[in-house]
Amino acid sequence: VPLSRTVRCTCISISNQPVNPRSLEKLEIIPASQFCPRVEIIATMKKKGEKRCLNPESKAIKNLLKAVSKERSKRSP
């Protein structure tokens, strides 16, 4: 990773764009900590492994989180 992580936050910009859950490889939610004062959501896409920072305050992103957790709860026994 090019930037040293002595701080630091991961996201330089954030996106409101909803992501299709089917195109998601992984969704990480990083809670606020001493390293970064804000919650960060990082979506890793199946296509090319693109990583995109999502806006935790966006309605569309909140809906995505709900959809993903619903999907996970369906899968788990």
């Epitope: 090019p2 930037l3 701080v7 630091r8 996201c11 330089i12 910009s13 996106s15 804000r38 995109r52």
Partner: antibody, heavy 124, light 109 residues
Framework: QVQLVESGGGVVQPGRSLRLSCTAS????????MHWVRQAPGKGLEWVAV????????YYADSVKGRFTISRDNSKNTLYLQMNSLRAEDTAVYYC?????????????????WGQGTTVTVSS | EIVLTQSPGTLSLSPGERATLSCRAS???????LAWYQQKPGQAPRLLIY???SRATGIPDRFSGSGSGTDFTLTISRLEPEDFAVYYC??????????FGPGTKVDIK
């Protein structure tokens, strides 16, 4: 429409200070990282500094470290570059540029919106 | 510090021809961190390609990017009159954080 407008350039003597501003419109400024990039007369592009959307991450080119400070005021949709101890080699057109949507330290989406630039001339 | 070298320095071609621009890094660069820009005289740069091969919004499909490791290429399949400009590659990496190549000028033969 999406727009960045730089201001504050001018002619200044070596050793003096100048503050550049970049006013954003047409997008949610508080969600985007922002850069300053400069271009000396007849030369290529040189990256100067970056600040993340919330101001938590700030990085500088070695050539300006300790002399220039990048900052932002999200309530005013404005990016700043405070330039101290100016040198003749700082003479350039200074552009502000927006970092791509969702960009992060693992994946770089490029600088997708640029202003038209403001000219800084350092001369005695 | 990673240094980017672009070749050729100047490319003289006619409209309709194919342009192949090279960007070479002094050490390996992740394709996630490579971008290409176009700049016309008196204008600000314009983002063409990010992630080595993804076209930016509104960029015509005659522009394509490829490559990995230390060798990257920008291809313009058929030059249009408005494509004559200077092209810069750029990488995002360790200090200095963002580095531009010296540019390739594409001019009319």
């Amino acid at each position: 429409q999406v727009q960045l407008v730089e201001s504050g350039g001018g002619v200044v003597q070596p050793g003096r200070s100048l503050r550049l501003s970049c006013t954003a419109s047409g997008f949610t400024f508080s969600q985007y990282g922002m850069h300053w990039v400069r271009q000396a007369p007849g030369k290529g592009l040189e990256w100067v500094a970056v600040i993340s959307y919330g101001g938590d991450i700030k990085y500088y080119a070695d050539s300006v470290k300790g002399r220039f400070t990048i900052s932002r005021d999200n309530s005013k949709n404005t990016l700043y570059l405070q330039m101290n101890s100016l040198r003749a080699e700082d003479t350039a057109v200074y552009y502000c540029a927006r970092e791509g949507e969702g960009s992060n330290i693992y994946y770089y989406y490029g600088m997708d919106v640029w202003g038209q630039g403001t000219t800084v001339t350092v001369s005695s | 510090e990673i240094v980017l070298t672009q070749s050729p320095g100047t490319l003289s071609l006619s409209p309709g021809e194919r342009a192949t621009l090279s960007c070479r890094a002094s050490q390996s660069v992740s394709s996630s961190y490579l971008a290409w820009y176009q700049q016309k005289p008196g204008q600000a740069p314009r983002l063409l390609i990010y992630g080595a091969s993804s076209r930016a919004t509104g960029i015509p499909d005659r522009f394509s990017g490829s490559g990995s490791g230390t060798d990257f290429t920008l291809t313009i399949s058929r030059l249009e009159p408005e494509d004559f400009a200077v092209y810069y590659c750029q990488q995002y990496g360790s200090s200095p954080i963002f580095t531009f190549g010296p540019g390739t000028k594409v001019d009319i033969k």
